[in-house]
């Protein structure tokens, strides 16, 4: 499978909410012994490999934000820790995987990465990730609502081993 990032750039005004999205493409094994681990984290530009560095999102680590579910299931973070930080990650039946960030501040600007791992009965088999940028703006130049910029098809379907 691949991970696509429908949008490579999100430009949002301070105080707004935003939902960053990744999408699983291609055949997804839904066998009973196959599960998926999905998470989000921050990273930085200028590395040899995008998303190799991992930073927390609002002090929450990739493990705090992770989802783990079967190939045929939907899931979302229900724990208080994420919600207290204005965060919620979710995954639906159609391969969409997202993180919602509420009440954005300038400190939320940066590079965000989603990670999806296919696990076949205890064994981590495939690891793929996607990257996107969030710019939070303030002042008269800021948009009134979030503006999203589509990825080029080449970028959005790029597979990168994490």
């Amino acid at each position: 499978f691949k991970v696509a990032t429908p949008y490579s750039l999100y430009v949002c005004p301070e105080g707004q909410n935003v939902t960053l999205t990744c999408r699983l493409l291609g055949p997804v094994d839904k066998g009973h012994d196959v599960t998926f681990y999905k998470t989000w984290y921050r990273s930085s530009r200028g590395e040899v490999q995008t998303c190799s560095e991992r930073r927390p999102i609002r002090n929450l680590t990739f493990q705090d934000l992770h989802l783990h579910h079967g190939g045929h299931q939907a899931a979302n973070t229900s724990h208080d820790l994420a919600q207290r930080h204005g965060l919620e990650s979710a995954s639906d039946h159609h391969g969409n995987f997202s993180i919602t960030m509420r009440n954005l501040t300038l400190l939320d600007s940066g590079l965000y990465c989603c990670l999806v791992v296919e696990i076949r009965h205890h064994h981590s088999e495939h690891r793929v990730h996607g990257a996107m940028e969030l710019q939070v703006q303030t002042g008269k130049d800021a948009p009134s609502n979030c503006v999203v910029y589509p990825s080029s098809s080449q970028d959005s379907e790029n597979i990168t081993a994490a």
């Epitope: 009973h32 599960t35 681990y37 998470t39 990739f62 493990q63 992770h66 783990h68 990670l115 791992v117 696990i119 205890h122 064994h123 981590s124 690891r127």
Partner: antibody, heavy 121, light 106 residues
Framework: QVQLQQSGAELMKPGASVKISCKAT????????IEWVKQRPGHGLEWIGE????????NYNEKFKGKATFTADTSSNTAYMQLSSLTSEDSAVYYC??????????????WGQGTLVTVSA | QIVLSQSPAILSASPGEKVTMTCRAS?????MHWYQQKPGSSPKPWIY???NLASGVPARFSGSGSGTSYSLTISRVEAEDAATYYC?????????FGGGTKLEIK
């Protein structure tokens, strides 16, 4: 906080059976495998098998088929391992361990405190 | 069955020394996990997927390897590191542990 609490030590007669319990708290018990591990002095750690509480699905180390039987009760978040036809070779500390998926890698992330089973006439 | 052979069985080191223990697999593996066990206690998850430290593990520990050969290294041993270290594979049933390396501090 995840915790696995095992039942207390057992002194058993040869030929008898024993049932060890492992109560889980702090996570979704039904969704993660419970592993069972044997440790005899000087013998290291030996994987016996596993159960997925939500479905009741089990996998056994061939060596322990017929010796160990796993069950789980999702209403009490408790997993059980029964050992039958006990011999002195079954004298050991038995651990339950909870599968944790960390960074997309499953491993034995949570361990019970161990249950000592002694088989003696 | 994949057999994991750990060496040495016993390792004696002085505080501040660098030590390395190895784990060899009878078949090639994608990665290896390591656990630490102290006498009278349950094993603790220590290093996952060959080289990643579990939460709370001191940075003096590191792991490396690929294929059939893996190792755990402590850059500067401390007294609290005295324990037995086990490697473990979760690639094929039966899932197996190595025989352990007991680290003694002089």
């Amino acid at each position: 906080q995840v915790q696995l609490q095992q039942s207390g030590a057992e002194l058993m007669k040869p030929g008898a059976s024993v049932k060890i319990s492992c109560k889980a708290t702090g996570y979704t018990f039904s969704r993660y495998w419970i592993e069972w591990v044997k440790q005899r002095p000087g013998h290291g750690l030996e994987w016996i098998g596993e159960i997925l509480p939500g479905s009741g699905s089990t996998n056994y180390n061939e060596k322990f088929k017929g010796k160990a039987t796993f069950t789980a009760d999702t209403s009490s978040n408790t997993a059980y391992m029964q050992l039958s036809s006990l011999t002195s070779e079954d004298s050991a500390v038995y651990y339950c361990a909870g599968e944790e998926v960390y960074d997309g890698y499953p491993w034995f992330g949570y361990w019970g405190q161990g249950t000592l089973v002694t088989v003696s006439a | 069955q994949i057999v994991l052979s750990q060496s040495p069985a016993i390792l004696s080191a002085s505080p501040g020394e660098k030590v390395t223990m190895t784990c060899r697999a009878s078949s090639s593996l994608s990665y290896m996990h390591w656990y630490q066990q102290k006498p009278g206690s349950s094993p603790k998850p220590w290093i996952y997927a060959t080289s990643n430290l579990a939460s709370g593990v001191p940075a003096r520990f590191s792991g490396s390897g690929s294929g059939t050969s893996y190792s755990l290294t402590i850059s500067r041993v401390e007294a609290e590191d005295a324990a037995t270290y086990y490697c473990q594979q979760w690639s094929s049933n039966p899932y197996t542990f190595g025989g352990g390396t007991k680290l003694e501090i002089k």
